[in-house]
Interface confidence: medium
C-alpha cells in the first residue's frame, strides 16, 4: 500500500485547512491508527492528533477545538483532519503518520502554506492642476502572502509604476498613477484593481480624480452693439468662465465706481434703464484658489434712435 | 534529492548581455522563492534578485532596470537576463531556495564581463 | 536598506575552543506578528556555495552540528561554534530576510590558532 497525500496544502487565513492522508492498500488491510504531528524546527515534532479506528479522535491540548476529522461519509482508511481558522503560524511541515495491519507503517510530510489577502489602501496624490508636467495621481498598496497584483483601470491616460518588496512572511506592492493633468479630467474615475490568490474576486477601490483649473474669462451681451442705446431695459453682461473648484466673480469699472443702479448678481451685471452715463470700460474679474482672470469691454450707449436732436448731438459731439 | 544546477555563464564584453539558468529538481518547485546571489573573486555575497511564487520580482538598486529575473514553472526552471552588463557584475552567480533562509543553493555559474 | 555589519573580519581560534562571531543589522529583524527574527547565519567553505547553518537567529538547520548555536533578537545577534573542529575552517555570513533588498554581512572568516 501507499500514502496519498499532497506536497502543499493552500487555505486562506480564516478558513479550514484539509491536512490529506489516505491509505490505498490491499481490501484485506486495515488501518488501525493515524498520527498527526507539527514538525517545528525550534520544538521537535510536536502532536497535533491521534486518529484511533477504534477510539476515535484525539486531539492534543495545544489543538483543542482546532483539530476535526472531516465530516461523514467517512472511509475507515481516510486519516485526514480539519485544521480549523488556519493563521500564519499555522505556516510549516506537518506530518501523518499510519499505522496498518498486516503492511505496517507509513509516513508523509507535506507543507501547510497560510494565504494572506491583502487590504489595499488607495492614497490620492497633491493637488492636481492643470499646466503641471507629470504629476502622481494616486498610489495603490497591497499587502500578503503570496504578493498581490496591483494594476489600475481607467479611461484617462496615464502611467503606471509599480515597486514591491518582501517582508518577512508577506509582500508589499505599491503600484502608482503618473499623469498630465488637464481639465478634461476632472471627475474621472481611477481605479485600483488588487488580484490575489486568497481573493474571490478582485478587490477595486476608485479615486475621484480632481483637477484644479481656470479658463480663461471673456463677456457676453455686447454682441449687437445697437441694442445698447438709452431706455434699453434688462441689459445685462454675462462673464463666461469655468474652473474646479467653481469660480467666485466681481464686476469693476475701469474708469470710476459702477454706476448706481448697476447691479451685481454672481457672474451677471444687471442695468438699470440705459443712459449715456453707463458707457465706460467693464471689467470682469474670475478667480478661483489656483488663479484669476479678467476680461474687460468697453459699453458705449447709444443715443435714443427716435430722438433725432440727440442723434444730431452724438453724432456732432463724435 | 533536492538539487538546482546553474548555467549560461561565460565571457562577455561590457554592454552585453547574458542569460543565466538555474535547473530544479526534488521539489515543487512552484510553492517555492527563488534568488539569485552572486560573489566576486575573493568578495562577500551579494543579493541580486528574487521572485515570489506568483511572478513577484525583487531586486537591489545595483541591478535594478538591467536584471530581469523571471520563473518557467512547468519546466521547473528559474532564469536570470542581464543587459548592460559591466566590469563589476563579474562573479560567481548562484541561485537559490528560500524557505527560512535559502535552505538550498546551487554550484554556481562563473559570468566574467571583461573587453 | 538595513546594512548588516559583522565582527570581527577574521577570527583564529584554537581546536576545541569557542568562536564566537557577532553581527549587527541597522535596523531590527523582529517581526512582531510571529516574534520571530528573519534572520540567517551561512557558512561557506572554499570552491563550494555556502550553507544554510541557522535561521530565525536560533534554529538550527536540520543535519547541522549542535556545536553551532545562534542567539539574539532585533538589532544584536551572535554566531557561536562552541567547540571548534578541523572542519568548521570557513567564512561565515549573517543574512538578514526580513525585508528586500535582503542584505549580507561582509562575512567573518574563521581559522584555526
Known amino acids: 500500500g501507499e500514502l496519498e497525500t499532497s506536497d502543499l496544502v493552500t487555505v486562506v487565513l480564516g478558513q479550514d485547512a484539509k491536512l490529506p492522508c489516505f491509505y490505498r492498500g490491499d481490501p484485506d488491510e486495515q488501518v488501525g491508527q493515524v498520527a498527526w504531528a507539527r514538525v517545528d524546527p525550534n520544538e521537535g515534532t510536536r502532536e497535533l492528533a491521534l486518529l484511533h479506528s477504534k477510539y476515535g479522535l484525539h486531539v492534543s491540548p495545544a489543538y483543542e477545538d482546532r483539530v476535526e476529522q472531516p465530516p461523514p461519509p467517512r472511509d475507515p482508511l481516510d486519516g485526514s483532519i480539519l485544521l480549523r481558522n488556519a493563521v500564519q503560524a499555522d505556516e510549516g511541515e506537518y506530518e501523518c503518520r499510519v499505522s496498518t495491519f498486516p503492511a505496517g507503517s507509513f509516513q508523509a510530510r507535506m507543507r501547510l502554506r497560510v494565504l494572506v489577502p491583502p487590504l489595499p489602501s488607495l492614497n490620492p496624490g497633491p493637488p492636481l492642476e492643470e499646466g503641471q508636467g507629470l504629476t502622481l495621481a494616486a498610489s495603490c498598496t497591497a499587502e500578503g502572502s503570496p504578493a498581490p497584483s496591483v494594476t489600475w483601470d481607467t479611461e484617462v491616460k496615464g502611467t503606471q509604476s509599480s515597486r514591491s518588496f518582501k517582508h518577512s512572511r508577506s509582500a508589499a506592492v505599491t503600484s502608482e498613477f503618473h499623469l498630465v493633468p488637464s481639465r478634461s479630467m476632472n471627475g474621472q474615475p481611477l481605479t485600483c484593481v488588487v488580484s490575489h490568490p486568497g481573493l474571490l474576486q478582485d478587490q477595486r477601490i476608485t479615486h475621484t480624480l480632481q483637477v484644479a483649473f481656470l479658463a480663461e474669462a471673456s463677456v457676453r451681451g455686447l454682441e449687437d452693439q445697437n441694442l445698447w442705446h438709452v431706455g434699453r431695459e434688462g441689459a445685462t453682461l454675462k462673464c463666461l468662465s469655468e474652473g474646479q473648484p467653481p469660480p467666485k466673480y466681481n464686476w469693476t469699472r475701469l474708469d470710476g465706481p459702477l454706476p448706481s443702479g448697476v447691479r451685481v448678481k454672481g457672474d451677471t451685471l444687471g442695468f438699470p434703464p440705459l443712459t449715456t452715463e453707463h458707457s465706460g470700460v467693464y471689467v470682469c474679474h474670475v478667480s478661483n484658489e489656483l488663479s484669476s482672470r479678467a476680461s474687460q469691454v468697453t459699453v458705449e450707449v447709444l443715443a435714443d434712435p427716435e430722438d433725432p436732436g440727440k442723434q444730431v448731438d452724438l453724432v456732432s459731439a463724435s | 534529492e533536492v538539487q538546482l544546477v546553474e548555467s549560461g555563464g561565460g565571457l562577455v564584453q561590457p554592454g552585453g548581455s547574458l542569460r543565466l539558468s538555474c535547473a530544479a529538481s526534488?521539489?515543487?518547485?512552484?510553492?517555492?522563492?527563488m534568488h539569485w546571489v552572486r560573489q566576486a573573486t575573493g568578495k562577500g555575497l551579494e543579493w541580486v534578485s528574487a521572485?515570489?511564487?506568483?511572478?513577484?520580482?525583487y531586486y537591489p538598486g545595483s541591478v535594478k532596470g538591467r536584471f530581469t529575473i523571471s520563473r518557467e514553472n512547468a519546466k521547473n526552471s528559474l532564469y536570470l537576463q542581464m543587459n548592460s552588463l559591466r566590469a563589476g557584475d563579474t562573479a560567481v552567480y548562484y541561485c537559490?531556495?528560500?524557505?527560512?533562509?535559502?535552505?538550498?543553493w546551487g554550484q554556481g555559474t562563473t559570468v566574467t564581463v571583461s573587453s | 536598506d538595513i546594512v548588516m555589519t559583522q565582527s570581527p573580519d577574521s577570527l583564529a581560534v584554537s581546536l576545541g575552543e569557542r568562536a564566537t562571531i557577532n553581527c549587527k543589522s541597522s535596523?531590527?529583524?523582529?517581526?512582531?506578528?510571529?516574534?520571530?527574527?528573519?534572520l540567517a547565519w551561512y557558512q561557506q567553505k572554499p570552491g563550494q556555495p555556502p550553507k544554510l547553518l541557522i535561521y530565525?537567529?536560533?534554529t538550527r538547520e536540520s543535519g547541522v552540528p549542535d556545536r553551532f548555536s545562534g542567539s539574539g533578537s532585533g538589532t544584536d545577534f551572535t554566531l557561536t561554534i562552541s567547540s571548534l573542529q578541523a572542519e568548521d575552517v570557513a567564512v561565515y555570513y549573517c543574512?538578514?530576510?526580513?525585508?528586500?533588498?535582503?542584505?549580507f554581512g561582509q562575512g567573518t572568516k574563521v581559522e584555526i590558532k
Open positions: 535596523q531590527s529583524v523582529l517581526y512582531n506578528s510571529n516574534n520571530k527574527n528573519y
Open positions: 521572485i515570489g511564487t506568483v511572478g513577484d520580482t
Open positions: 530565525w537567529a536560533s
Open positions: 526534488g521539489f515543487t518547485f512552484s510553492s517555492y522563492d
Open positions: 537559490a531556495r528560500e524557505w527560512n533562509g535559502m535552505d538550498v
Open positions: 543574512q538578514q530576510f526580513y525585508t528586500t533588498p535582503y542584505s
